[in-house]
Interface confidence: medium
């Protein structure tokens, strides 16, 4: 639709301002604009015939426009009286007509406004202040803004006079902020310089920082004191009533109990007269000793010992505190504390209790902390690993096992082959292997500390020939578009290619097929009934190859929306109606029927002899498969008629 | 002077064909808009079809639309109306006029005499 | 498509009366909107265009005004060679006439 843009719409008077033509249809003949809301001969502005590239000035031509060949308009130097409609005329080639009005509205720019103000240094509670926006201007907004934010709504704020004077009522401290007005109209918005409103308060109630009131012998004791006032307040201190300083500040090095005492800051305000005070008592103690854990076991065993750890020393009326590993103890019914919090017991260590732990007296003034203690947790041996993790070599080859243990102190290590000693160290290194290496290779861990030993065996084959693999799979009955499967090939042999193939050839390109693991790993994303086939794989290296047995993958799906058969929804009164349900399911679904929403037998056929019009109605099939979780449902509308009403309705079985 | 001559009318059967032609002179014909109208005996006046100087434009009424074809020949002067598959409705005399130039082609300033079209078996 | 209803249909006047004819679109066509003359076995005559102005050659007693869907044709005083069947045309969407509007001596 032809449509005309006004940019500006709001145009500043000297400006220009374009009538920008939006949609203008192809294949024109030619175009006019108008002043107005129609097309009007005698407030014709211009006249444009493509053809010709001329342009035709009419009655309502100032000598201001200037029309553009996409058939835009742009009004330059605007004055007042160019504010209203215009209308653009198109004529297009197959002589069919659109017409389309834009508007636009002419303002003057503003000067730059100031403010007045009836009181340059109000007293807080007291004073009322009246900014005024200057000068006064005809179609103008007057806004005012506080530390350059809109106005806060509040009852001691008002405004009058049009919006051009600001009164804020019994100021207060807040009220001292930067004020500025600004003018608007559409094409125009001029802000004041700030006026800064300095409001006379104060003094407040002194605070005397900082807030402890309790310190210890030998410390320096520096109290400051502050109280909100404009101008500033001038400070005097007090000890016990007696005059020491004017200062905003008291400072005592050194100090002891003969400091404690009552402690008295007055603030003055030479502008507003007033004077306040605030007293805070200061209490001096003497230096409490610092703490220290003792432990009845250093050394205890991991699922063994208990451990009692105490804070030293004993010290009336205190309170003990602990913590383990720099946090506050956690709740654990292995850790418990004695009645005075003094004894931290752990129940049958393990080795995530080493620590570190800290115990801590708190007096009045602050919490007086231990060295930390870290707890010597003898445990293992865990079961060893042997790694690498390969099972098969071939002859030739280096065979290099290491063997670890999680152990405290660090395991002692022992190599077996088939159940004879072979030496003490925590690797096995064979070179040139054969054949006759291949057996049963155990590694022993033993714990001197703990006497404890643990022991792993691993089968060690040596052959050229590969082994014929085998499939594992994590998931044997997976769920379509639910369930992920992976496959890998066993046994993992050192520089060995693993090879895949689904029912006989090649793995697939697809997104939801990714091998990993050096190929050994074959997973499926969001398996798919398709994807139950055989899958087969294979290892090999120079001298051999050889395949798996296939696993064929058993997915389970469905049920899918069952299918009614026959077809048919009309029968003859007297036949016989048999239907039946079928559903894609995996493994088959369980059928229940419902004739108008009433259960009825849980069979995949429903057969009804010798119908008659009472058993029109809805008939609904329900699927359920146990295995997915899954429902679903069909309805048929059946419509049975009196014989010999209806011709071509069906005869039924 | 501007003159407008139609020619090519006259008996036809229903389902046949005819040509009319309108032979242009007293103005630059090649920059006109060109159209034709049609009345039928005892009848009121019904635009039929339109043409661009440049023949690129063209426009027509529903009632013959895929079956007349406006057409024209700048260097002869000439404005064409090739009417197929006529119908006994086509029954009319056929002017043709032109559309002004200026200040836009929207009505028809001069027309021809018109020619007799009969579609009758 | 745009419809155009002409009223009244026929019309008897005497020479000198001042006689109007109104034309009504079926949806707002601006000011596209044109007035025909036509005689017995003559060709159509245009009279007014673009709704009001006035075509070179046409007596000034004719006179045609309207904007959207309304328009009227006026003859001020009706002279002898003024009784003929008058047309209107819209130009909006090429470009339908009336019925017509045939003006007989009373």
């Known amino acids: 639709k032809l449509t005309i843009e006004s940019t500006p719409f709001n145009v500043a008077e000297g400006k220009e301002v374009l009538l920008l033509v939006h949609n203008l249809p192809q294949h024109l003949f030619g175009y006019s604009w108008y002043k107005g809301e129609r097309v009007d001969g005698n407030r014709q502005i211009i006249g444009y015939v493509i053809g010709t590239q001329q342009a035709t000035p009419g009655p309502a031509y100032s000598g201001r426009e200037i029309i553009y060949p996409n058939a835009s308009l742009l009004i330059q130097n605007i004055i007042q009286n160019d504010t209203g409609f215009y209308t653009l005329h198109v004529i297009k080639s197959d002589l069919v007509n659109e017409e389309a009005t834009g508007q636009f509205r002419v303002y003057p720019e503003l000067p730059k406004p100031s403010i007045s103000s009836n009181n340059s240094k109000p007293v807080e509670d007291k004073d009322a202040v009246a900014f005024t926006c200057e000068p006064e201007t005809q179609d103008a907004t007057y806004l005012w803004w506080v530390n350059n934010q809109s106005l806060p709504v509040s009852p001691r704020l008002q405004l009058s006079n049009g919006n051009r004077t600001l009164t804020l009522f019994n100021v207060t401290r807040n009220d001292t902020a930067s004020y500025k007005c600004e003018t608007q109209n559409p094409v125009s918005a001029r802000r004041s310089d700030s006026v800064i409103l300095n409001v006379l308060y104060g003094p407040d109630a002194p605070t005397i920082s900082p807030l402890n009131t309790s310190y210890r012998s030998g410390e320096n004791l520096n109290l400051s004191c502050h109280a909100a006032s404009n101008p500033p307040a001038q400070y005097s201190w007090f000890v016990n009533g007696t005059f020491q300083q004017s200062t905003q500040e008291l400072f005592i090095p050194n100090i002891t109990v003969n400091n404690s005492g009552s402690y008295t800051c007055q603030a003055h305000n030479s502008d507003t007269g007033l004077n306040r005070t605030t007293v805070t008592t200061i209490t001096v103690y003497a230096e409490p000793p610092k703490p220290f854990i003792t432990s009845n076991n250093s050394n205890p065993v991991e699922d063994e010992d208990a451990v009692a750890l105490t804070c030293e020393p004993e010290i009336q009326n205190t309170t003990y505190l602990w913590w383990v590993n720099n946090q506050s103890l956690p709740v654990s019914p292995r850790l418990q504390l004695s009645n005075d919090n003094r004894t931290l017991t752990l129940l049958s260590v393990t080795r995530n209790d080493v620590g570190p732990y800290e115990c801590g007296i708190q007096n009045e003034l602050s919490v007086d902390h231990s060295d930390p203690v870290i707890l010597n947790v003898l445990y293992g041996p865990d079961d060893p690993t042997i790694s690498p993790s390969y099972t098969y070599y071939r002859p030739g080859v280096n065979l290099s096992l290491s063997c670890h243990a999680a152990s405290n102190p660090p395991a002692q290590y022992s190599w077996l082959i088939d159940g004879n000693i072979q030496q003490h160290t925590q690797e096995l290194f064979i070179s040139n292997i054969t054949e006759k290496n291949s057996g049963l290779y155990t590694c022993q861990a033993n714990n001197s500390a703990s006497g404890h030993s643990r022991t792993t065996v691993k089968t060690i084959t040596v052959s050229a020939e590969l082994p014929k693999p085998s499939i594992s799979s994590n998931n044997s009955k997976p769920v379509e578009d639910k369930d992920a499967v992976a496959f890998t090939c066993e046994p993992e042999a050192q520089n060995t290619t693993y090879l895949w193939w689904v029912n006989g050839q090649s793995l697939p390109v697809s997104p939801r097929l990714q091998l990993s693991n050096g190929n050994r790993t074959l997973t499926l994303f969001n398996v798919t009934r398709n994807d139950a086939r055989a899958y087969v794989c294979g290892i090999q290296n120079s001298v051999s190859a050889n395949r798996s047995d296939p696993v064929t993958l058993d997915v389970l799906y469905g049920p899918d929306t069952p299918i009614i058969s026959p077809p048919d929804s009309s029968y003859l009164s007297g036949a016989n109606l048999n239907l039946s349900c079928h559903s894609a399911s995996n493994p088959s679904p369980q059928y229940s029927w419902r004739i108008n929403g009433i259960p009825q037998q849980h069979t995949q056929v429903l057969f009804i002899a010798k119908i008659t019009p009472n058993n029109n109605g809805t008939y609904a099939c329900f699927v359920s498969n146990l295995a997915t979780g899954r429902n679903n449902s069909i309805v048929k509308s059946i419509t049975v008629s009196a014989s010999g009403t209806s011709p071509g309705l069906s005869a039924g079985a | 002077e501007v003159q407008l001559l139609e020619s090519g009318g006259g008996l036809v059967q229903p389902g046949g064909s005819l040509r009319l032609s309108c032979a242009a002179s007293?103005?630059?014909?090649?920059?006109?808009?060109m159209g034709w109208v049609r009345q039928a005996p005892g009848k009121g006046l019904e635009w039929v079809s339109s043409?661009?100087?440049?023949?690129?434009?063209?426009s027509y009424a529903d009632s013959v639309k895929g079956r007349f074809t406006i057409s024209r020949d700048n260097s002869k002067n000439t404005l064409y109306l090739q009417m197929n598959s006529l119908r006994a409705e086509d029954t009319a005399v056929y002017y043709c006029?032109?559309?002004?130039?200026?200040?836009?082609?929207?009505?028809?300033?001069?027309w021809g005499q018109g020619t007799l079209v009969t579609v009758s078996s | 498509d745009i419809q155009m209803t002409q009223s009244p249909s026929s019309l008897s006047a005497s020479v000198g009366d001042r006689v109007t004819i109104t034309c009504r679109a079926s949806?707002?066509?601006?000011?596209?909107l044109n007035w025909y003359q036509q005689k017995p076995g003559k060709a159509p005559k245009l009279l007014i265009y673009a709704a009001s102005s006035l075509q070179s050659g046409v007596p000034s007693r004719f006179s045609g005004s309207g904007s959207g869907t309304d328009f009227t044709l006026t003859i001020s005083s009706l002279q002898p060679e003024d009784f003929a069947t008058y047309y209107c045309q819209q130009a909006g969407n090429p470009h339908t006439f009336g019925q017509g509007t045939k003006l007989e001596i009373k």
């Open positions: 043409i661009g100087s440049g023949s690129y434009s063209t």
């Open positions: 007293g103005f630059t014909f090649s920059s006109s808009y």
């Open positions: 949806q707002s066509i601006s000011s596209y």
């Open positions: 006029a032109r559309y002004p130039s200026v200040p836009f082609p929207l009505h028809l300033d001069y």
